[in-house]
C-alpha cells in the first residue's frame, strides 16, 4: 500500500477505564496531513462519531471506556501530499481491582508506572493523563495505599503531587484519580504508581538531554536557506523551556526587524518515560555575518550550539 512503517508502541491498559492515544510523529504530523485510525488489519477506519465507544477524535483514538475485547494492534496512517507513514500500537487490556473493598486487597500495581522519590529532598510524582481536548478532566485526587492523601507535606500542583521532605514511609502504592467528562458522560480514570525511595542524590528537577546539535559546525553556502532541528529528550510534564539564542538573545528578538532567522514551532513525541521535543531554527538566507557565530539551542540548563562555516572551495571546478 506504499505506506512506510515507522514504529510499534506497546501499551498495557486497565479495562473499564478511558484510554486515548495520539498519533503524532513530528515533523511528519506538523505539516498538512490526514490521520486515519484502523483496528488490526481492517480496511474500515475507526468511527469518527463521537457517541461511539471507540472513535477517532482529530489525531487521537479514544476508548470510552476500554473493554476486554479491545486488545489488539491498531494502526494510525498519516498521509501527506507525497507521503504515507504508519504507526502500530499494540494494546493489551486486562482487569484490575484497585481498592475495591469487596475484594479487600491493595491494587496490583507491579506493571504500572514506576516512580522514584529522593529521600530527604522535596520531590514530586506525576499523574500521566493524555487525552484529547474534547475530554474535560476534573481535579486530580491522590491516594496512597487506598487512602486519600492529605497533609502539610503534600501539594497537588496540576498533574503533580509535590512531596516535601521525602521519608522512607513515602514508598508504596499510589494512585491518581480524575473524572473525565466527554459529551456529557462521566468516566473515572485511575492510574497506579509504584513509588520507591532512593537515597542517591537526585538533581534538582529534570535535566534535559540535547540529542542534536552536538556543538559542531555546519558547512553551508552563502545565500542558501537552512533549517536546523534541535532535538531534546526530557521528562514528561517538565517545566523546561526550549529555544534558540544568538548572542544570549532569543533569535526571534535578535532578528525582530528582518525576521531573516526565526525559531520554529515546537513539536514533541510522547514516549512512555519521556518526551522528545523538536524546535527548529530557520535561516531564510544565510549571510556572511552568520558564519562563525554560535547559534545556541537551550533546553532548561542544557545547551548545544551549531556554527555555520563556508564550504571549502572545490578546486575541481577550476
Amino acid at each position: 500500500d506504499g505506506c512506510k512503517d515507522i514504529f510499534m508502541k506497546n501499551e498495557i491498559l486497565s479495562a473499564s477505564q478511558p484510554f486515548a492515544f495520539n498519533c503524532t510523529f513530528p515533523p511528519i504530523t506538523s505539516g498538512e496531513v490526514s490521520v486515519t485510525w484502523y483496528k488490526n488489519s481492517s480496511k474500515i477506519p475507526v468511527s469518527k462519531i463521537i457517541q461511539s465507544r471507540i472513535h477517532q477524535d482529530e489525531t487521537w483514538i479514544l476508548f470510552l471506556p476500554m473493554e476486554w475485547g479491545d486488545s489488539g494492534v491498531y494502526q494510525c496512517v498519516i498521509k501527506g501530499r507525497d507521503s504515507c507513514h504508519r504507526i502500530h500500537v499494540n494494546l493489551t487490556v486486562f482487569e484490575k481491582h484497585w481498592c475495591d473493598t469487596s475484594i479487600g486487597g491493595l491494587p496490583n500495581l507491579s506493571d504500572e508506572y514506576k516512580q522514584i522519590l529522593h529521600l530527604g529532598k522535596d520531590d514530586s510524582l506525576t499523574c500521566h493523563l493524555h487525552f484529547p481536548k474534547s475530554c474535560v478532566l476534573g481535579p486530580i485526587k491522590w491516594y496512597k495505599d487506598c487512602n486519600e492523601i492529605k497533609g502539610e507535606r503534600f501539594t497537588v500542583l496540576e498533574t503533580r503531587l509535590l512531596v516535601s521532605n521525602v521519608s522512607a514511609e513515602d514508598r508504596g502504592n499510589y494512585a491518581c484519580q480524575a473524572i473525565l467528562t466527554h459529551s456529557g458522560k462521566q468516566y473515572e480514570v485511575l492510574n497506579g504508581i509504584t513509588v520507591s525511595i532512593t537515597e542517591r542524590a537526585g538533581y534538582g528537577g529534570s535535566v534535559p538531554k540535547i540529542i542534536y546539535p552536538k556543538n559542531h559546525s555546519i558547512e553551508v553556502q552563502l545565500g542558501t536557506t537552512l533549517i536546523v532541528d534541535c532535538n531534546v529528550t526530557d521528562t514528561k510534564d517538565n517545566t523546561n523551556l526550549r529555544c534558540w539564542r544568538v548572542n544570549n538573545t532569543l533569535v526571534d528578538d535578535y532578528y525582530d526587524e528582518s525576521k531573516r532567522i526565526r525559531e520554529g514551532v515546537e513539536t514533541h513525541v510522547s514516549f512512555r518515560e519521556h518526551n522528545l521535543y523538536t524546535v527548529n531554527i530557520t535561516f531564510l538566507e544565510v549571510k556572511m555575518e552568520d558564519y562563525g557565530l554560535p547559534f545556541m539551542c537551550h533546553a532548561g540548563v542544557s545547551t548545544a550550539y551549531i556554527i555555520l562555516q563556508l564550504p571549502a572551495p572545490d578546486f575541481r571546478a577550476y
Partner: antibody
Framework: DVQFQESGPGLVKPSQTLSLTCTVT?????????WNWIRQPPGKGLEWIGY???????NYNPSLKSRVTITRDTSKNQFSLKLSSVTAADTAVYFC??????????WGQGTLVTVSS | DIQMTQSPSSLSASVGDRVTITCRAS??????LNWYQQKPGKAPKLLIY???MLHSGVPSRFSPSGSGNDYTFTISSLQPEDIATYYC?????????FGGGTKVEIK
C-alpha cells in the same frame, strides 16, 4: 502546602529601585519549577514580570527586561525582585507565584507598592 | 508578544444562568491556555489549566473548551460565589501573557 509571602517596602520614590522578596514554604525552590513575579496595577489586568527557575536560570518580560533582576537565596528559600528606575506606572500589587508545567498554580496574597515622591 | 483578547469585558447575569467567556490568542498556543478567578483584594486563583483540566477543588460547573487560537470558559449555573473577574493566560510562548479580564456580576 506550598505557600508564599511577599515582603518589601510599600512606598518607593520615582527613579529609585523597587525591591521585593518572596519567601516560600512547603517546597524547595531548587527542587523544580519556575518561581515567578507578576504584577497588577490598581484596577487593571495582570502582567508577567519574569521568573527564576529551580536551576537558577532567569527569564524576563522584554517590556521590563532592561530594569528587572530576579535573584534567589536558596538558604532562606527566597527569591527576590529588583525593578530599577521606577515611575508612577510601576505602582501595582506585586505577586509571586509558582509555575507548574502549564500554569501559575499557586500565588502569594500580593503586596501593594506605590511609587510616589 | 502573543495578545490575548477576552470578551466580554464585563457581564451581568442572574443566579442559575449559563455564562460564557471567550479568549482569542493572536497566535497558535497549542492548548497552553489557563483560566483564573480573582475576587476583589485577593490573588488570582487557578481554575483551569492546559485548556481542559480542572484544578484541585474547582467545581464541575466550570467547563472549558477550545483549541488552536480560540478558547471558551463556561459557568453552567452561576452561583453568588462566582462573582469575580476571570482572566485567561497563555503559557505557550514567552513572555507569558494574560487577557484583559472579564468582570462577572449578579443582576
Amino acid at each position: 502546602d506550598v505557600q508564599f509571602q511577599e515582603s518589601g517596602p510599600g512606598l518607593v520614590k520615582p527613579s529609585q529601585t523597587l525591591s521585593l522578596t518572596c519567601t516560600v514554604t512547603g517546597y524547595s525552590i531548587t527542587a523544580d519549577f519556575a518561581w515567578n513575579w507578576i504584577r497588577q496595577p490598581p484596577g487593571k489586568g495582570l502582567e508577567w514580570i519574569g521568573y527564576i527557575s529551580y536551576s537558577g536560570d532567569t527569564n524576563y518580560n522584554p517590556s521590563l527586561k532592561s530594569r528587572v533582576t530576579i535573584t534567589r537565596d536558596t538558604s532562606k528559600n527566597q527569591f527576590s525582585l529588583k525593578l530599577s528606575s521606577v515611575t508612577a506606572a510601576d505602582t501595582a500589587v506585586y505577586f509571586c507565584a509558582i509555575r507548574g508545567p502549564y500554569s501559575f498554580t499557586y500565588w502569594g496574597q500580593g503586596t501593594l507598592v506605590t511609587v510616589s515622591s | 508578544d502573543i495578545q490575548m483578547t477576552q470578551s466580554p469585558s464585563s457581564l451581568s447575569a442572574s443566579v442559575g444562568d449559563r455564562v460564557t467567556i471567550t479568549c482569542r490568542a493572536s497566535q497558535w498556543i497549542n492548548n497552553y491556555l489557563n483560566w483564573y478567578q480573582q475576587k476583589p483584594g485577593k490573588a488570582p486563583k487557578l481554575l483551569i489549566y492546559y485548556t481542559s483540566m480542572l484544578h484541585s477543588g474547582v467545581p464541575s460547573r466550570f467547563s472549558p473548551s477550545g483549541s488552536g487560537n480560540d478558547y471558551t470558559f463556561t459557568i453552567s449555573s452561576l452561583q453568588p460565589e462566582d462573582i469575580a473577574t476571570y482572566y485567561c493566560q497563555q503559557g505557550h510562548t514567552l513572555p507569558w501573557t494574560f487577557g484583559g479580564g472579564t468582570k462577572v456580576e449578579i443582576k
